[in-house]
Interface confidence: low
């Protein structure tokens, strides 16, 4: 049998497993599509994304909103001809996430 | 130019973007690679996988020691059969990690 | 606050090595984009930038001088070394130890080099 | 290399009168990034050389407004407005634009 404590360590993790905007570490390059004569140093930045599970495996967790944060970032150009510029970039950061269908039904499926 | 504090901050980021195990949300039945009449609630839990980024493109984050943490689970089989089981199911939890080349360098490359 | 301060010989011969110690506080060269590099200026004459080294021990050299020019860090004494080889009397100058920003904002004091026999 | 030429050598000034020095470069000094480093130093006498106008037209933090850059490509100007005393020294431009960085010849700066 299982006890009340037992059941309720199990709820708690699988809270903290659910579809929310959790802390990623992403690639500004792959991000921003940038030529590749161009780098950024750090190569990544931290931001929240839509991460975690949904209940149903139709479901997908996915972004419902996104603010864009502005992160201090050297642009190196390669051959390096300058001193490295610091420069503000945008990356986006997902403020609120859903679980969703993966993809939309269609209307006589 | 950039100020001092600028560059702390900076360096402050990048030393969170940086390889290393993180929390991480992972599916139990595709860890397990158990049949598909037989699921798992919750169907995710968290343990910690290597992740973040290295300093060069040839360069992936890997995981060099795993230990193995055990998670009550509810073990459900499909039709239901039974009272849903409580099980321990155990999970590799990275422990420590470390850029890696993606490929072992050829002897005469 | 950011200080820099140059150290070597006042006098070398020609041929020889000239080895330049610049000391700094106020930043390590262990955070993530600093540099630190070398500049120097003939008497009444214009500037001219050496070489430079990063966080990451990136070194960048002129190009002129390239073969002539070591640069080397040692971040736990804040500390970055510069040697230059086959020293010559046009080789006389002062020699500025800077933080590399861009533009370079912080100087040392600067240490005058003759180079005489 | 890219060369910096200032002009003029010298310049005898009286205080409250402007003065102009131009600095011209022997290409373009806009990176591919849009950025134009383009910069001016003071070196005062016995001193080292200190910032005074970044990116062309920026004043460096306490930099008396009286001093101004402008230009673009491959000309550029610094300006002051009302010359005072203490403004006597060596001008120099300075390209950190293209590897390696230069330096202008200067211009001396002295009150007549």
């Known amino acids: 049998f299982y006890d009340i404590e037992t059941l309720k360590v199990i709820d708690e993790e699988w809270q903290r497993t659910q579809c929310s905007p959790r802390e990623t570490c992403v690639e500004v390059a792959s991000e921003l599509g940038k030529s590749t004569n161009t780098f950024f140093k750090p190569p990544c930045v931290n931001v929240f994304r839509c991460g975690g599970c949904c209940n149903e495996e139709s479901l997908i967790c996915m972004n419902t909103s996104t603010s864009y944060i502005s992160k201090q970032l050297f642009e190196i150009s390669v051959p390096l001809t300058s001193v490295p510029e610091l420069v503000p970039v945008k990356v986006a950061n997902h403020t609120g996430c859903k679980c969703l269908p993966t993809a939309p039904r269609h209307p006589y499926s | 130019f950039y100020d001092i504090e600028t560059l702390k901050v900076i360096d402050e980021e990048w030393q969170r973007t940086q390889c290393s195990p993180r929390e991480t949300c992972v599916e139990v039945a595709s860890e397990l690679g158990k049949s598909t009449n037989t699921f798992f609630k919750p169907p995710c839990v968290n343990v910690f996988r290597c992740g973040g980024c290295c300093n060069e493109e040839s360069l992936i984050c890997m995981n060099t020691s795993t230990s193995y943490i055990s998670k009550q689970l509810f073990e459900i089989s499909v039709p239901l059969t039974s009272v849903p089981e409580l099980v321990p199911v155990k999970v590799a939890n990275h422990t420590g990690c470390k850029c890696l080349p993606t490929a072992p360098r050829h002897p005469y490359s | 606050q950011v200080t820099l301060k140059e150290s070597g010989p006042a006098l070398v011969k020609p041929t020889q090595t000239l080895t330049l110690t610049c000391t700094f506080s106020g930043f390590s060269l262990s955070t993530y984009g600093m540099g630190v590099g070398w500049i120097r200026q003939p008497p009444g004459k214009a500037l001219e930038w050496l070489a430079n080294?990063?966080?990451?021990?990136?070194?960048y050299y002129n190009p002129v001088l390239r073969s002539r020019l070591t640069i080397s860090k040692d971040t736990s004494k804040n500390q970055v070394v510069l040697t230059m080889t086959n020293m010559d009397p046009v080789d006389t100058a002062t020699y500025y130890c800077?933080?590399?920003?861009?533009?370079?904002?912080?100087w040392g004091q600067g240490t005058l080099v003759t180079v005489s026999s | 290399d890219i060369v910096m030429t200032q002009t003029p050598l010298s310049l005898p000034v009286t205080p409250g009168e402007p003065a102009s020095i131009s600095c011209r470069s022997s290409?373009?000094?806009?990176?591919?990034?849009?950025?134009?480093?383009l910069h001016w130093y003071l070196q005062k006498p016995g001193q080292s050389p200190q910032l005074l106008i970044y990116?062309?037209?920026n004043r460096f933090s306490g930099v008396p407004d009286r001093f101004s850059g402008s230009g673009s490509g491959t000309d550029f100007t610094l300006k002051i407005s009302r010359v005072e005393a203490e403004d006597v020294g060596v001008y120099f431009c300075?390209?950190?634009?293209?590897?390696?960085?230069?330096f202008g010849g200067g211009t001396k700066v002295e009150i007549k």
């Open positions: 290409q373009s000094l806009v990176h591919i990034n849009g950025n134009t480093y």
């Open positions: 300075s390209q950190s634009t293209h590897v390696p960085w230069t």
């Open positions: 080294i990063w966080w990451n021990d990136d070194k």
């Open positions: 800077v933080q590399v920003t861009n533009p370079f904002v912080f």
């Open positions: 990116k062309v037209s």
